[in-house]
Interface confidence: medium
């Protein structure tokens, strides 16, 4: 349905609070370096303009598209050229090219200082002094650091952030109340950002067919009692929502997400028995709850798939008639029967089935050719099963920190050209799969582990695309979305890599090491470990363990010394010399 004024339509649908929040997020995700005050000024101007359009949809400029209105506003920023360089060239373009240009300049790794958390009393004072500004600042700081964060979900995070302060700033022990809540929001926020980044990469790099396939598989696992037509309707709507958000159309995205939540709650009976408690909640919480809802129970009497997808003589006829629908039904039927499989595995099985039909339906005896197709699935299923089993055993044996170190060594040997900060970040996150998934029952381990690894490896792909250094990484990232994880798993030691020259500066440490948090200490040590492997890629596990144990002992000794800096100055070169000798 068309509206005379799109901006008025969205303002009325979303309400002023959500409208302003979403516009702030949109602007912060596009112009990530602009100061907070500049963005607030732009948002206020857009909001005032929207109100004039609500009052009179025929007023001047109210008929313009949101991209035109928002793009024009962004292009009024005076320091665009100095701050953003070539991004300023976007402003010379017309829509839709201008918006595409802004999208291409989104920076997944902006050069912004890490957010420092002030003292609790300082935060509570700021919250009480100006709650609205405090919450806007949160939206701004998160959005500029995570330019693909799912905007309507970020509003939900902001609501939780507000609730945490409202509750804890009244508490007797403010810090004990607030800090765990902020830690939880930070960790959940990072996870949410990374998951959304994979959705956007899927849409932007592999097209909406890839996203729809992912969504069919995931929603069929969640809603195994729903009919295929129902799942397909949800997939179509969900694809529209994520396409909009990934494309910077945040008002449309939030509006359509609300419509989808409404539809799901009005049609619970034909979707899932698990939606009831979500549907009693207010909008932001409801949408979040629906997105995270647990899998419904599988219908008891599902027949074997073989009859329709292998034994039937009509397989090729049905496939030829409407390939995507037939494959979609296959994926739906397989996924609803297998909540114990990762989505990526289900997509690999669908690809294998498609490849078999492409080959066999052109053969002399198609039925004979595809009769054993389900047997071909076995190795595809066993590979992630074995991977999860082996890595969970390793995690249980080593604990999280040492498991991360094993992965650091493994991935540095595979792709030593990748920057050390990226290898440390990605390997630390890969290592978190243990604590997240290995404690789960067998039936939940693979979907948890492999789908989490896909999210983490997408982060590697996104960072690598910005500054490509490894053909192997490019190949694994671009050839096939569903085979990214197996592609990285299959990489071996890079024999062509020329070891990095030894640089003593890299292994020089100072007394400031002693005041770091446990996490920061780990990152320092893991940074050194990556540099060691880049210097000696063929070093054995035992050699590396010896060096790292010595490193830990050296740091511990100097941090206990009276004159810490003198200790580091004296013991540091000894540690470096001993390490070189051990690795020679």
């Amino acid at each position: 349905d068309t509206h005379k004024s799109e901006v008025a339509h969205r303002f009325k649908d979303l309400g002023e609070e959500h409208f302003k929040g979403l516009v702030l997020v949109a602007f912060s995700q596009y112009l990530q370096q602009c100061p907070f005050e500049e963005h607030v000024k732009l948002v206020n101007e857009v909001t005032e303009f929207a109100k004039t359009c609500v009052a009179d949809e025929s007023a001047e400029n109210c008929d313009k598209s949101l991209h035109t209105l928002f793009g024009d506003k962004l292009c009024t920023v005076a320091t665009l050229r100095e701050t953003y360089g070539e991004m300023a060239d976007c402003c010379a373009k017309q829509e839709p090219e201008r918006n595409e240009c802004f999208l291409q300049h989104k920076d997944d790794n902006p050069n912004l200082p890490p957010l420092v958390r002030p003292e609790v009393d300082v935060m509570c004072t700021a919250f009480h002094d100006n709650e609205a500004t405090f919450l806007k600042k949160y939206l701004y700081e998160v959005a500029r650091r995570h330019p693909y964060f799912y905007a309507p979900e970020l509003l939900f995070f902001a609501a939780r952030y507000k609730a945490a302060f409202a509750e804890c700033c009244q508490a007797a022990d403010k810090a004990a109340c607030l800090l765990p809540k902020l830690d939880e929001l930070r960790d959940e926020g990072k996870a949410s950002s990374a998951k959304q980044r994979l959705k956007c990469a899927s849409l932007q790099k592999f097209g909406d067919r890839a996203f729809k396939a992912w969504a069919v598989a995931r929603l069929s696992q969640k809603f195994p009692k729903a009919e295929f037509a129902e799942v397909s309707k949800l997939v179509t709507d969900l694809t529209k929502v994520h396409t909009e958000c990934c494309h910077g159309d945040l008002l449309e995205c939030a509006d359509d997400r609300a419509d989808l939540a409404k539809y799901m709650c009005e049609n619970q009976d034909s979707i899932s028995s698990k939606l009831k408690e979500c549907c009693d909640k207010p909008l932001l919480e409801k949408s979040h709850c629906l997105a995270e809802v647990e899998n419904d129970e599988m219908p008891a009497d599902l027949p074997s798939l073989a009859a329709d997808y292998v034994e039937s003589k009509d397989v090729c006829k049905n496939y030829a008639e409407a390939k995507d629908v037939f494959l979609g039904m296959f994926l739906y039927e397989y996924a609803r029967r297998h909540p114990d499989y990762s989505v990526m595995l289900l997509l690999r099985l669908a690809k294998a089935y498609e490849a078999t039909l492409e080959k066999c339906c052109a053969a002399a005896d198609p039925h004979e050719c595809y009769a054993k197709v389900f047997d071909e699935f076995q190795p595809l299923v066993e590979e992630p099963q074995n991977l999860v089993k082996q890595n969970c055993e390793l995690f249980e044996q080593l604990g999280e920190y040492k498991f991360q170190n094993a992965l650091l060594v493994r991935y540095t040997k595979k792709v030593p050209q990748v920057s050390t900060p990226t290898l440390v970040e990605v390997s630390r996150n890969l290592g978190k799969v243990g604590a997240k998934c290995c404690k789960l029952p067998e039936a939940k381990r693979m979907p948890c582990a492999e789908d989490y690894l896909s999210v983490v490896l997408n982060r590697l792909c996104v960072l690598h695309e910005k500054t490509p250094v490894s053909e192997k990484v490019t190949k694994c990232c671009t050839e096939s979305l569903v085979n990214r994880r197996p592609c990285f798993s299959a990489l071996e030691l890079d024999e062509a890599y020329v070891p990095k020259a030894f640089n003593a500066e890299t292994f020089t440490f100072h007394a400031d090491m002693c005041t770091l948090s446990e996490k920061e200490k780990q990152v320092k040590k893991q940074t050194a470990l990556v540099e060691l492997v880049k210097h000696k890629p063929k070093a054995t596990k035992e050699q590396l363990k010896g060096v790292m144990d010595n490193f830990a002992a050296f740091v511990e000794k100097c941090c206990k010394a009276d004159d810490k800096e003198a200790c580091f100055a004296e013991e540091g070169p000894k540690f470096v010399a001993a390490s070189q000798a051990a690795l020679a």
């Epitope: 009919e227 037509a229 027949p303 049905n318 008639e321 409407a322 979609g328």
Partner: nanobody, 128 residues
Framework: QLQVVESGGGLVQAGGSLRLSCAAS????????MGWFRQAPEKEREFVAG?????????DYADSVEGRFTISRDNAKNTAYLQMNNLKPEDTAVYYC????????????????????WGHGTQVTVSS
């Protein structure tokens, strides 16, 4: 919501022909059996014809229309058709299109309960 819309009904002389169309709002409907039912005044709704998923698959007809009516579908247009020839006064009824939810190999059911989505119907009147 998923929608089904019938068209093509009207008034026709006995012995004449009509072609009913049934348009589905979703591409995914090509994956399901489709059926035509009819309901004459003061009578129960009854099965007329059905076609299983995808063109060229199984068709099924009520004995009263066998040889006179032909069901077909055009998946590219998300549409099913009922070609009615040699119409009789007793064919007068509201004709309903319905879409089932069976696995792809399934035969089109005759039982109303196996059809989940229904149109509002189109009136067919055959005068003698």
């Amino acid at each position: 919501q998923l929608q089904v819309v019938e068209s093509g009904g009207g008034l026709v002389q006995a012995g004449g022909s009509l072609r009913l169309s049934c348009a589905a709002s979703e591409r995914t409907f090509v994956a399901y059996p489709m059926g035509w039912f009819r309901q004459a005044p003061e009578k129960e709704r009854e099965f007329v014809a059905g076609i299983s998923w995808f063109a060229g698959a199984t068709t099924d007809y009520a004995d009263s229309v066998e040889g006179r009516f032909t069901i077909s579908r055009d998946n590219a247009k998300n549409t099913a058709y009922l070609q009615m020839n040699n119409l009789k006064p007793e064919d007068t009824a509201v004709y309903y299109c319905a879409i089932s939810h069976q696995l792809p190999g399934g035969r089109p059911g005759r039982d109303m309960d196996s059809y989940s989505y229904w149109g509002h119907g189109t009136q067919v009147t055959v005068s003698s």
